[in-house]
């Protein structure tokens, strides 16, 4: 006769965790409370993480790895809990943990599968390299190998060239895209799966500006509303591109509201800041500014560059003082 | 008092299935896990696996892993094994028994004999 | 796996005999050693967890001792009902693990 209400035998209960490189995560395991607690924790099945039993722990042969990284919730036991607190995990601690849980009249084992995941902030570097001109989407370190697109003028482009270099533990990754000549605006995406999350990076190139020497430039630059979020930390910085190298003109830091000028003919308007709007405006042009001025608004979500190119002329009266 | 009744003996062949049951009674069912222990012939006690009645999981010996499926009936508070593809390796006294690490009420025994 | 070895597969005692039934585990089992009893044609009878505790009704003429990886079960004064197989059982971790048995002779 079959049961009518039955359960079937299940070896493990699995549950997935995923933690960020360096970061303290918990490996959760939950028992019916009972008396006398042992419970030990492994991973991979054989190397030992954390045991505990008779009221305390007993770690004289916990692997070395894990030496002063683990330990209980030692006033939740007695509640049906035997979660691991885990600190700095590494890519080299991805895998299976088993949590063997015996009371005085129950046993149970959890099975916790552990994947780490590396997103270090990426960047979008504007770059000059002889007569061409390059973006570059670059992330110092990721893992698990991240998916980048790129689009122009939001159109997805196939061409995707990917540098990768491995290190131990994660990739190091630049995407360079050759935009010489071109007047479009480029995104550039990269996606970390894992740890389901996404970084933009946004490029819009604005008309020439031609200016006469002692006037003054006012240069735009206002985020796209699709990324910024004014809740979010940024900092904002204005910098002038000269022989191939960019110099920092001034920036703003969103957490302190704090506004740093290098170049004292720059100035930023406060209120206009209070707005979201990083519009800067140049004094006393001289024909040394001549060039490409660019904004770069930045988070741990997104990039968005403006650039601005700036042509100074002699004024009437210099020209005809020569 | 603490009962664990299993069902008689059983004598099947070669290839078949069987499936044995443990009738408890004089305590909360659903509180302890129910262990399985194979004793063959002449030989040691041999841990097959657990089950914990309130959810169906619990730790169990990685050798009989596709040979025992544990199933419970809380309704009538009753614990079963199934054991497959039976071998003549696989007669031998069969346990039911209560308990968490150590095991502190067992059932009488069922003897399976395999043979054509 | 635990490997629990008893050595003695079998022991000749007296009735009034003290005598000392061993196990020992193939790593550090931190006494969580329990021992069980089987006489002849019944199923095994719990005496001993962690390593020294008695279970309920069990005589006091039984005793359990030992750490790390070598444990004892010691009856202080035999008596004929005594006669049976002796098991020891690691329950410090899964899969749990029996010893070979040790069998009980009574001269």
């Known amino acids: 006769i079959f049961p009518l209400a039955f359960f079937i035998y299940v070896p493990m209960n699995e549950q997935i965790v995923i933690g960020r490189l360096d970061e303290d995560i918990i490996l959760p395991s939950s028992f019916e409370r009972g008396s006398e607690v042992v419970i030990h924790w492994k991973y991979q099945d054989s190397y030992k993480v954390h045991s505990y039993y008779k009221g305390s722990d007993h770690l004289e042969s916990q692997d070395p790895r894990y030496a002063n990284r683990t330990s209980l919730f030692y006033n939740e036991i007695q509640n049906g809990n035997a979660s691991l607190f885990f600190r700095r995990v590494s890519l080299l601690d991805e895998g299976i943990y088993t949590c063997y849980v015996g009371t005085a009249i129950q046993v149970i084992t959890n099975k916790v599968v552990l994947k780490v995941g590396v997103f270090l902030t990426p960047v979008m570097k504007y770059e000059k390299r002889n007569t061409n001109s390059f973006l570059i989407c670059s992330v110092l370190s990721v893992y698990p190998r991240p998916i980048i697109t790129w689009k122009m003028d939001n159109t997805p482009i196939s061409e995707n060239n990917m540098e990768e270099t491995g290190s131990l533990d994660s990739f190091s990754i630049n995407s360079p895209l050759n935009i010489t000549g071109s007047n479009s605006s480029y995104e550039c995406t990269i996606e970390n799966s894992l740890l389901k999350q996404t970084w933009t990076g946004r490029w819009t190139m604005k008309d020439g500006l031609h200016k006469m020497q002692s006037e003054h430039v006012s240069l735009s630059c206002q985020p796209v509303n699709d990324y910024f979020s004014p809740n979010q930390d940024f900092k904002v910085t204005w910098s002038r591109m000269k022989s191939g190298t960019f110099s920092v003109l001034a920036y703003y830091l969103s957490s302190s509201q704090n506004t740093i000028i290098n170049e004292s003919r720059f100035s930023w308007n406060k209120e206009l800041i209070n707005q979201s709007d990083f519009s800067m405006n140049l004094m006393d042009l001289n024909l040394s500014d001549s060039g490409e001025y660019l904004c770069n608004i930045s988070s741990d979500e997104y990039t968005l560059l403006t650039i601005h190119t700036v042509h100074v002329e002699p004024s009437q009266e210099t020209a005809s003082h020569n | 008092e603490v009962q664990l009744q299993q069902s008689g003996p059983e004598l099947v062949k070669p290839g078949a299935s069987v499936k044995i049951s443990c009738k408890t009674s004089?305590?909360?069912?659903?509180?302890?896990?129910m262990h399985w222990v194979k004793q063959s012939h002449g030989k040691s006690l041999e841990w097959i696996g657990g089950?914990?009645?309130?959810?169906?999981?619990?730790p169990y010996n990685q050798k009989f892993k596709g040979k025992a499926t544990l199933t419970v009936d809380k309704s009538s508070s009753t614990a079963y094994m199934e054991l497959r593809s039976l071998t003549s390796e696989d007669s031998a006294v069969y346990y039911c028994?209560?308990?968490?690490?150590?095991?502190?009420?067992w059932g009488q025994g069922t003897t399976l004999t395999v043979s054509s | 796996d635990i490997v629990m070895t008893q050595s003695h597969k079998f022991m000749s005692t007296s009735v009034g005999d003290r005598v000392s039934i061993t196990c020992k585990a193939s790593?550090?089992?931190?006494?969580?050693v329990a021992w069980y009893q089987q006489k002849s044609g019944q199923s095994p009878k719990l005496l001993i967890y962690?390593?020294?505790t008695r279970h309920t009704g069990v005589p006091d003429r039984f005793t359990g001792s030992g750490s790390g990886t070598d444990y004892t079960l010691t009856i202080s004064s035999v008596q004929a009902e005594d006669l049976a197989l002796y098991y020891c059982q690691q329950h410090y971790d899964t899969p749990f693990t029996f010893g070979g048995g040790t069998k009980l002779e009574i001269k």
């Open positions: 004089g305590y909360t069912f659903t509180e302890y896990t």
């Open positions: 790593q550090d089992v931190s006494t969580a």
């Open positions: 962690w390593a020294s």
């Open positions: 028994a209560r308990g968490g690490y150590y095991f502190d009420y």
């Open positions: 089950i914990n009645p309130n959810n169906g999981g619990a």
